[in-house]
Interface confidence: low
């Protein structure tokens, strides 16, 4: 049976949520339970994604759309359509091959995911540090020293930043 579509193709009018049965007699059969077809003219229905283990269901599967997963608490999504779940770390940490590690001095991470990033170098913009950085927060740059009123003092600028921490593998 040639798979080329035409107006006469028995499958061409089958809507999403149905499939054109392989026994060549049924025109449009509803997708069986736990399967879906998101487009018309399908010859099979796709098996619904199952959100198991570290994945949890964000949106149930229907006859016309796949299930959508997210991650259980303590994990976050990575990849298209949340194809992977990666362990959360605390703010001020990054995930390495050996687990969660504190950000090195001069770097910070204000999220539970991702890598530690260097503090902003205020002096590059000709500004001074208004609030020191921490492992969890970037520095806050203030006005340039020249803009400071007489007698005002600036906070000591941070040490030179290192390269960003390694990304999780």
């Amino acid at each position: 049976f040639e798979r080329t579509r035409s107006l006469q193709d028995p499958c061409s009018n089958c809507p999403a949520g149905t499939f054109c049965d392989n026994n060549r007699n049924q025109i449009c059969s509803p997708c069986p339970p736990n399967s879906f077809s998101s487009a018309g003219g399908q010859r099979t229905c796709d098996i619904c994604r199952q959100c198991k283990g570290v994945f949890r269901t964000r949106k149930e599967c229907s006859s016309t759309s796949n299930a959508e997963c997210d991650c259980t608490p303590g994990f976050h999504c990575l990849g298209a359509g949340c194809s992977m779940c990666e362990q959360d770390c605390k703010q001020g940490q990054e995930l390495t091959k050996k687990g969660c590690k504190d950000c090195c001095f001069g770097t910070f991470n204000d999220q539970k995911r991702g890598i530690c990033r260097p503090w902003t170098n205020c002096s590059l913009d000709g500004k001074s540090v208004l609030v020191n950085g921490t492992k969890e927060r970037d520095v806050v740059c203030g006005p340039s020293p020249a803009d400071l009123s007489p007698g005002a003092s600036s906070v000591t600028p941070p040490a030179p930043a290192r390269e960003p921490g390694h990304s999780p593998q």
């Epitope: 107006l7 028995p10 007699n25 449009c28």
Partner: antibody, heavy 116, light 108 residues
Framework: QIQLVQSGPELKKPGETVKISCKAS????????MSWVKQAPGKGLKWMGW????????TYADDFKGRFAFSLETSASTAYLQINNLKNEDMAIYFC?????????WGQGTTLTVSS | QIVLTQSPAIMSASPGEKVTMTCSAS?????MNWYQQKSGTSPKRWIF???KLASGVPARFSGSGSGTSYSLTISSMEAEDAATYYC???????????FGSGTKLEIK
């Protein structure tokens, strides 16, 4: 149970029109195509074509293009075969059959006699 | 258009005898279906997708083949098997169906 019940025998003159019905029951009508098959007296089976009961699109075999028309009354789960401008060679038994690739249930057949 | 040639056109077999009839396609087809028709009745789907027996068909029947050559076999002929058997295929775009000319099987 699944049944295809066809209309009764027809006696027609050449040049007339006949419309044969095929009423389906026991399944969802629009899920299966409907084929039509001709069997002339003492001859074999000849596939005439089929109609997609979901879309209403008919497909005709080359020998049955022109005077032959398949139609549907979906609300009544009924398929029709109409033959216009009848000829002597149209004299045959006409079967409807559920499906299109390998029809699995067949009507009892409608005998069409064409005689002047 | 694919032409299906059945042979023999007519054959007879004694009860208990093995029977084989063939269907040759003018070009390669993906599968073959077989129908049984007894005089004065509607055809019945007998074998579909080359080798699958339709509901109620005795296990003494089998179907096989590929490409252009297909066959229907009865391992042990019985009186009730006397009938005409038609092969049928479906292919092309737009897809069309064709029947073979039939093999008439008689009981000796």
């Amino acid at each position: 149970q699944i049944q295809l019940v066809q209309s009764g025998p027809e006696l027609k003159k050449p040049g007339e029109t006949v419309k044969i019905s095929c009423k389906a029951s026991g399944y969802t009508f629009t899920t299966y195509g409907m084929s039509w098959v001709k069997q002339a007296p003492g001859k074999g089976l000849k596939w005439m074509g089929w109609i997609n009961t979901y879309s209403g699109v008919p497909t005709y075999a080359d020998d049955f293009k022109g005077r032959f028309a398949f139609s549907l009354e979906t609300s009544a789960s009924t398929a029709y075969l109409q033959i216009n401008n009848l000829k002597n060679e149209d004299m045959a038994i006409y079967f409807c059959a559920r499906g299109y690739g390998s029809p699995d249930y067949w009507g009892q057949g409608t005998t069409l006699t064409v005689s002047s | 258009q694919i032409v299906l040639t059945q042979s023999p056109a007519i054959m007879s077999a004694s009860p208990g005898e093995k029977v084989t009839m063939t269907c040759s396609a003018s070009s390669s087809v993906s599968y073959m279906n077989w129908y049984q028709q007894k005089s004065g009745t509607s055809p019945k789907r007998w074998i579909f997708d080359t080798s699958k027996l339709a509901s109620g068909v005795p296990a003494r029947f089998s179907g096989s083949g590929s490409g252009t050559s297909y066959s229907l076999t009865i391992s042990s002929m019985e009186a009730e098997d006397a009938a005409t058997y038609y092969c049928q295929q479906w292919s092309g775009n737009p897809p069309i169906s064709t029947f073979g000319s039939g093999t008439k099987l008689e009981i000796k």
